[in-house]
């Protein structure tokens, strides 16, 4: 571990003296002196600072631009930034969620492994043997082939990853 520095936690060193940092939600107005404490002021509306700091300006809250498909997930405070997420059917293009794109659909032959959220895209998987998907969808999983046997029918046409099996009546034995 790093050895302790001359100023304690929540202090900073300036001109050979340790001054108190400003608490989250406040900005620095003036450093302490030998005779006065650090002077801090609360951040204004739509501003924030999320750490103990010596910043002279607060940061602006993030703007969730509806033109980019964004909406407010959590309103910012003086100590926290606004959190944006995407409108229904869309997801963020990055961790910072600065813009949104439409959820991906899984093509025929692929099913939805994980439905998209506001921050992650649809995850598709190929339909394994015994399953199919005949639609392009952002929600549909691979469906199991119909079981002809349970319906007392026989397979007339084999299923694929894109099509269900076709069942038909069993051939009657001629007398």
């Amino acid at each position: 571990p790093e050895p302790p520095t001359a100023c304690r936690e929540k202090q900073y060193l300036i001109n050979s003296q340790c001054c108190s940092l400003c608490q989250p939600g406040q900005k620095l107005v003036s450093d302490c002196t030998e005779f006065t404490e650090t002077e801090c002021l609360p951040c204004g509306e739509s501003e924030f600072l999320d750490t103990w700091n010596r910043e002279t300006h607060c940061h602006q809250h993030k703007y969730c631009d509806p033109n980019l498909g964004l909406r407010v997930q959590q309103k910012g405070t003086s100590e926290t930034d606004t959190i944006c997420t995407c409108e229904e059917g869309w997801h963020c293009t990055s961790e910072a969620c600065e813009s949104c794109v439409l959820h991906r659909s899984c093509s025929p032959g692929f099913g939805v492994k994980q439905i998209a959220t506001g921050v992650s895209d649809t995850i598709c998987e190929p339909c394994p043997v015994g399953f199919f998907s005949n639609v392009s969808s952002a929600f549909e999983k691979c469906h199991p082939w119909t079981s002809c046997e349970t319906k007392d029918l026989v397979v007339q046409q084999a299923g694929t990853n894109k099509t269900d099996v076709v069942c038909g009546p069993q051939d009657r034995l001629r007398a």
Epitope: P3, T5, S16, Q17, T33
Partner: antibody, heavy 116, light 107 residues
């Protein structure tokens, strides 16, 4: 009144170490940082480091931090600077000073001569 | 590290003169600039801190100005007792650094 009394001149051999003391009086020792600086003959001042006598925490000049050790003894209101692996480049006057908006009060200086 | 440049290493002035010594920082240091006086016997005293605040016990003949990168120490009505070397020092960013000094002599 504020006073910083430093230890006397030292003549030391190359490769050895030296420990300079700085006894503070006239104020609350733990309430102010103690700064240390070096002045080679006919030259400017070079900052060595700073110690907080209250916590024992310190910051050093990167150029010298591997060889300098700052300590403080609250019971005797005395700060110390130890410098090891001395060379002729370390021959200088060493000053302690009280912090608090610059180096507000200075010791009289301690001459350290490194010579074989 | 921040460099402090005192362009005039020595200057001569007459008793009663007004003398100005400059100090330039290599980057913005706001007002974290201190001035010191070192007498010929080696003793050092703080004259001004935070660029312009007179330290206790320092005669009002000494004044300081400047902010950012350019700073000035002015001695009005120069006295014999002012014969010394004057250093500037920045307290904005570690490592603290000093100017090279300006030696003041009497003509």
């Amino acid at each position: 009144q504020v006073q910083l009394q430093q230890s006397g001149a030292e003549l030391v051999r190359p490769g050895t170490s030296v420990k300079v003391s700085c006894k503070a009086s006239g104020y609350a020792f733990s309430d102010y940082l103690i700064e240390w600086a070096k002045q080679r003959p006919g030259q400017g001042l070079e900052w060595i480091g700073v110690i907080n006598p209250g916590s024992g925490g310190s910051n050093y000049n990167e150029k010298i931090k591997d060889r300098a050790t700052l300590t403080a003894d609250k019971s005797s209101s005395t700060a110390y600077m130890q410098l090891s692996s001395l060379t002729s480049e370390d021959s200088a006057v060493y000053f302690c000073a009280r912090g608090g908006g610059g180096f507000t009060y200075w010791g009289q200086g301690t001459l350290v001569t490194v010579s074989a | 590290e921040i460099q402090l440049t005192q362009t005039t290493s020595s200057l001569s002035a007459s008793l009663g003169d007004r003398v100005t010594i400059s100090c330039r920082a290599s980057q913005d240091i706001s007002n974290y600039l201190n001035w010191y006086q070192q007498k010929p016997d080696g003793t050092i005293k703080l004259l001004l801190n935070f660029a312009s605040r007179l330290h206790s016990g320092v005669p009002s003949r000494f004044s300081g100005s400047g902010s950012g990168t350019d700073f000035f120490l002015t001695i009005s009505n120069l006295e014999q007792d002012d014969i010394a070397t004057y250093f500037c020092q920045q307290g904005s960013t570690l490592p603290w650094t000093f100017g090279g000094g300006t030696k003041l002599e009497i003509k």
